[in-house]
């Protein structure tokens, strides 16, 4: 066969669908690889061909579009399963071609099973809600294109195994689930089950997402440096180890990059010659506020090192702060026999 631009296996698109549910899968060529859409390709005389490789097999085979009740069909650039079966799992290829042009891409499709509480190996999207922020909504995801707007589906929402009914602060409103005032207790997995009729059959779409309640922007503050502070002095003798923690609290801010760094005499540690190491640890509160600790360590400090300026810096979308550590050389305790005796006029 003639040359074909093969984009290989697009593992970025690890598509997971539930067993015994409808699935519509768009050919990734038009979404990620080619600069034109299906309509343009079709009107230019290009044909879209589908085939697949079963799980644990090497043999590419055509997709059977003659199954009872058109279980698998193709419509424009979409491959339809009505519904899926467990053994539909495999690598699917869509190829766009005519006599002079050919381009193809493969992608993995995994049909997964769920239990009665909607537990499954499905990777769940995470939706963040602000704590105590007023009414916020989540929407049943990825159900567009399954039924026409004239069809009115029934939607049932669940938290874990339990249908959402008479919850204190959560109200199902069709495709939306409203949180009157989001609390930590609202953390969890929420599932919408969309039921709709098609050609005398009833289909179900199950979509689960994880809700994570996070700090509200109303309560967000610039970074707070807890250490170093004015109450602690790092007093060392030359040759001792100097350890200075920089501990910074960051309010949760959506999409904010939190940064902590040290400067020594105004320079980054990498840019100076002294033997310094920095270890970082990060912890999160239940609302995803973040505490970062960077420990600056000099194994054997010199008297020159003890004269330097050590400043901890922190930055978030809310602002930038800095705090200098109080570092000084320990004055050696007087040795009685020599210093004190001299002081008393002994010769």
């Amino acid at each position: 066969s003639e040359r074909c631009d093969d984009w290989g296996l697009d593992t970025m698109r690890q598509i997971q669908v539930f067993e015994d549910e409808p699935a519509r899968i768009k050919c990734p060529l038009f979404e990620h690889f080619l600069k034109f859409n299906y309509s343009t390709a079709h009107s230019a005389g290009l044909t879209l061909i589908w085939y697949w490789t079963r799980q644990d097999r090497d043999l590419e085979e055509p997709i059977n579009f003659r199954l009872p009740e058109n279980r698998i069909s193709k419509e424009k650039d979409v491959l339809w399963f009505r519904p899926t079966l467990l053994n539909d799992t495999g690598n699917y290829t869509c190829m766009l071609r005519n006599t002079t042009y050919c381009s193809k891409v493969a992608f993995p499709l995994e049909v997964v099973q769920k239990d009665s509480c909607f537990n499954s190996p499905m990777k769940l999207p995470v939706h963040k809600l602000y704590i105590e922020y007023g009414i916020q909504r989540i929407t049943c995801p990825n159900v567009d294109g399954y039924f026409p707007s004239s069809v009115k589906p029934t939607i049932t929402w669940y938290m874990g195994c339990y249908k959402i009914q008479n919850f204190n602060n959560v109200i199902p409103e069709g495709m939306n689930l409203s949180f009157l005032i989001a609390l930590i207790s609202n953390n969890g997995n929420y599932t919408c089950v969309v039921t709709y009729p098609e050609n005398g059959r009833t289909f179900h779409l199950t979509r689960t997402l994880t809700v994570k309640v996070v700090g509200s922007p109303k309560n967000a503050v610039p970074p707070v440096i807890h250490s170093p502070n004015d109450h602690v002095v790092y007093e060392k003798e030359p040759g001792e180890e100097l350890l200075i923690p920089c501990t910074v609290y960051f309010s949760f801010l959506m999409d904010s990059r939190n940064e902590v760094w040290w400067t020594i005499d105004g320079k980054k540690p990498d840019d100076i010659t002294i033997d310094v190491t920095i270890n970082e640890s990060i912890s999160h509160s239940r609302t995803e506020d973040e505490t970062r600790t960077q420990i600056l360590s000099i194994k054997k400090v010199t008297s020159e090192d003890l004269k330097r300026s050590y400043v901890c810096h922190a930055r978030s979308a809310k602002g930038e702060v800095a705090k200098a550590a109080k570092v000084k050389q320990k004055v050696p305790a007087p040795r009685y026999t020599v210093e004190l005796a001299c002081g008393f006029g002994a010769t």
Epitope: D115, S116, C117, Y162, F167, V170, S185, G188
Partner: antibody, heavy 119, light 107 residues
Framework: QVQLVQSGAEVKKPGSSVKVSCKAS????????IHWVRQAPGQGLEWMGA????????YYAQKFQGRVTITADESTSTAYMELSSLRSEDTAVYYC????????????WGQGTLVTVSS | EIVMTQSPATLSVSPGERATLSCRAS??????LAWYQQKPGQAPRLLIY???TRATGIPARFSGSGSGTEFTLTISSLQSEDFAVYYC?????????FGQGTKVEIK
């Protein structure tokens, strides 16, 4: 170690109500559902209903709808099951059981409360 | 509601022998089935969930199998402490329902 401790045996007259308590110790009360199951003498197990303490939502079997009320007090980690309009066939041992929000089986049970309905 | 039917009602087995208990659902419950053991005067104890997964602390002689409508609990070698009543329970659909129980007695 999580434990569910139920209130003591009750003898009730037909037409009256009974309220059975189930106190959880060992933490995590709010993160679980509490289910109620009953067992008539020499009979099998019958699911009555459940409550999600943190969400304040209760669920009931059709058979008991309107006659059973399940509540919870998070401050004392205690769930309650109240059954009204008692009749002799309600004589049974009533169990509470802990169930995870995402796991639908009963892993920890109370010791049971015998309710006898007799005139 | 889904009706769970257990058989036999009573099973007489000698210690050390194998016991096989059956549970049938009136419609498919997938693998959403649990088995419980109950001894006289005690609360039930979870043995198996997900049709075949042993609960924490349950000895390996207990095993569950099946999916859909037909399920089996097998006790490979009966010990004296295994003589009890065994219940299956489906949690595929609300309301959750139990079988009527199988009593395993000493032969």
């Amino acid at each position: 170690q999580v434990q569910l401790v139920q209130s003591g045996a009750e003898v009730k007259k037909p037409g009256s109500s009974v309220k059975v308590s189930c106190k959880a110790s060992g933490g995590g009360f709010s993160e679980y559902a509490i289910h109620w199951v009953r067992q008539a003498p020499g009979q099998g197990l019958e699911w009555m209903g459940a409550i999600l303490p943190e969400q304040g939502a209760a669920y009931y079997a059709q058979k008991f709808q309107g006659r059973v009320t399940i509540t919870a007090d998070e401050s004392t980690s205690t769930a309650y099951m109240e059954l009204s309009s008692l009749r002799s066939e309600d004589t049974a041992v009533y169990y509470c059981a802990r169930v995870g929000l995402y796991v639908p089986y009963m892993d920890i049970w109370g010791q049971g409360t015998l309710v006898t309905v007799s005139s | 509601e889904i009706v769970m039917t257990q058989s036999p009602a009573t099973l007489s087995v000698s210690p050390g022998e194998r016991a096989t208990l059956s549970c049938r659902a009136s419609q498919s419950v997938s693998s959403n089935l649990a088995w419980y053991q109950q001894k006289p005067g005690q609360a039930p104890r979870l043995l198996i969930y997900g049709a075949s997964t042993r609960a924490t602390g349950i000895p390996a002689r207990f095993s569950g199998s099946g999916s859909g409508t037909e399920f089996t609990l097998t006790i490979s070698s009966l010990q004296s402490e295994d003589f009890a009543v065994y219940y299956c329970q489906q949690y595929n659909n609300w309301p959750w329902t139990f079988g009527q129980g199988t009593k395993v007695e000493i032969k």
